[in-house]
Amino acid sequence: SGVFQLQLQEFINERGVLASGRPCEPGCRTFFRVCLKHFQAVVSPGPCTFGTVSTPVLGTNSFAVRDDSSGGGRNPLQLPFNFTWPGTFSLIIEAWHAPGDDLRPEALPPDALISKIAIQGSLAVGQNWLLDEQTSTLTRLRYSYRVICSDNYYGDNCSRLCKKRNDHFGHYVCQPDGNLSCLPGWTGEYCQQPICLSGCHEQNGYCSKPAECLCRPGWQGRLCNECIPHNGCRHGTCSTPWQCTCDEGWGGLFCDQDLNYCTHHSPCKNGATCSNSGQRSYTCTCRPGYTGVDCELELSECDSNPCRNGGSCKDQEDGYHCLCPPGYYGLHCEHSTLSCADSPCFNGGSCRERNQGANYACECPPNFTGSNCEKKVDRCTSNPCANGGQCLNRGPSRMCRCRPGFTGTYCELHVSDCARNPCAHGGTCHDLENGLMCTCPAGFSGRRCEVRTSIDACASSPCFNRATCYTDLSTDTFVCNCPYGFVGSRCEFPVGLPPSFPW
């Protein structure tokens, strides 16, 4: 679909005569008839196959035709066509004299013709005008013409319909050849597919408008390249949606069971060494000078009573210092300047001379110790409490404060998890390092043998002669359904043969 446009520019008829040579009275009131038809080697009369158009009277004798496209569209003249432009044409332009106001062909005398020109040739679709001038003996016509496509038609012959659109069936404008030119952000044959955010995962992401990245179920992240782990997954990851692959040191379905308490919580204080010993369980090995479950307690270096001979101990940042009583000296007040003559032994200790009276030694009564029998015996010095128990002096006696899981005077006994008979239905209890285990009797299961499981009494195939076996779930016994011809609790006897009883 397109339009053949003809722009009349100037007509010269200086003598004001008709084609017959006869003058017009009072002058030649000139209008034009245009015939557009298919290409003919010799342009001949006949149907105007591409269309016709007529003008009103445009002037008298000689005149210029002004461009009137804005005021009614009479010039250029429009010859629309609704077919593929063939690229060739024939054009006939006739100038006529109008004696009156009726311009219909049948209303005009045949000799009212002023001039007739006929041209033919090739013409490509395009915006450029072709200028031409045709001269006869008496007249001259200057004009230009072109073929353009109608709105929304494109291509070399105006055969391609294309309408720009911007809806969900396409986001495009039309190129000169009629092909689609996608608007920014759109792609596809019809420009209806949005170009997603750069990097948006091809399979796991999609978009409904440009630069968007919407995630399919199971995926997340700006580019939909991160899987969503199982709901409730605490310390785990996934490589495909709904997985929960535990991080190192974590276990369980949701990776919420701590298998590496040491690393995750650093419970041991003061540079102690931590060892994992099960789920949420650990042991701290303290550095010298520290004690407690988490090595959180600082041991006083004076606690070991290093000062002898009644010397008093003072804690210092870098150790301790002994203040010696008169007659003693040395790091631990171990050297004496006394002899037995000075009665150095306290608490009823007896003095013995040594080295020809230059030194002495005290023999202490029970419950006292020290080079001068000055110390009450500390019953905790031998570290009698086992399994990390804490020793406490209680007057003349001592006691051990045991760590959880241990008991006995010296914390030497492991508390038995089996002591409270946790296994139900006669299950046998076994103490383990981190708990207990129940061995269940037949017919029971579960961690504490608390679940009753039916014994399949039919498992041993007790019924004979192809009888059907049924388990009585209430008594865990079986019942045999005998086929025809057999009797007995196990269908072991044929009918007619009485059982042979031993009595």
Epitope: L161, K163, K164, D167, H168, F169, G170, E189, Y190, S208
Partner: antibody, heavy 121, light 104 residues
């Protein structure tokens, strides 16, 4: 050849939600060349476009119904569905599902046979 | 909202040409589809993109669209062409149907 089949209750009470499903057979609903639409026709009246959906889930609705209508797609079942809430007697119509073709400029080249939904108490 | 206007009815003698118009603002800048609907049946697409015929639609159906008016022409009308005809266009993401024309 692609066939479309509407299904759902033929009677809905006023103020309730109308729910219809369109099952596509003989072709994939995940084809990028089509939108899947719902059109209705009250008895003795003309056609009214309700809305449509792409296989990715992108939806487009008639503004006159937008706050009441929801269209969804289930590519695994090759189905798409219509929900219209707060219905009144004016929503009584034959409801059609249709395939709108991108290559045909949005022309609906395949229609279901239609299902009459009556809104009445 | 965008509206498409059709004459309620068009009468034509068998063998003659029926022309159904569809008017809307700058309709020529939009693609128009035409549907035929016979009583008790679903609509059938007879013209898409103004003038294109889907396969299986007889050549007597043709369409044009320019300015504010699209036209469906049935040349050599047959009794079987008696039906309701609807034009349809897309206006900014929304499908719009004409009011329908009964051809008898």
């Amino acid at each position: 050849e692609v066939q479309l089949q509407e299904s759902g209750p033929g009677l809905v009470k006023p103020s309730e939600t109308l729910s219809l499903t369109c099952t596509v057979s003989g072709g994939s609903i995940s084809s990028g060349s089509y939108y899947w639409g719902w059109i209705r026709q009250p008895p003795g009246k003309g056609l009214e476009w309700i809305g449509d959906i792409y296989y990715t889930g992108s939806t487009y609705y008639n503004p006159s119904l937008k706050n009441r209508v929801t269209i969804s797609v289930d590519t695994s079942k090759n189905q798409f569905s219509l929900k219209l809430s707060s219905v009144t007697a004016a929503d009584t119509a034959v409801y059609y599902c249709a395939r709108e073709s991108v290559p045909l400029g949005g022309g609906a080249d395949n229609w279901g046979q239609g299902t009459l939904v009556t809104v009445s108490s | 909202s965008y509206e498409l206007t059709q004459p309620p009815s068009v009468s034509v003698s068998p063998g003659q040409t029926a022309s159904i118009t569809c008017s809307g603002e700058s309709l020529g800048d939009k693609y128009v589809s035409w549907y035929q609907q016979k009583p008790g049946q679903s609509p059938v697409l007879v013209i898409y993109e103004d003038s294109m015929r889907p396969s299986g639609i007889p050549e007597r159906f043709s369409g044009s669209n320019s300015g504010d008016t699209a036209t469906l022409t049935i040349s050599g009308t047959q009794p079987m062409d008696e039906a309701d005809y609807y034009c349809q266009a897309w206006d900014s993401e929304v499908g719009v149907f004409g009011s329908g024309t009964k051809v008898t």
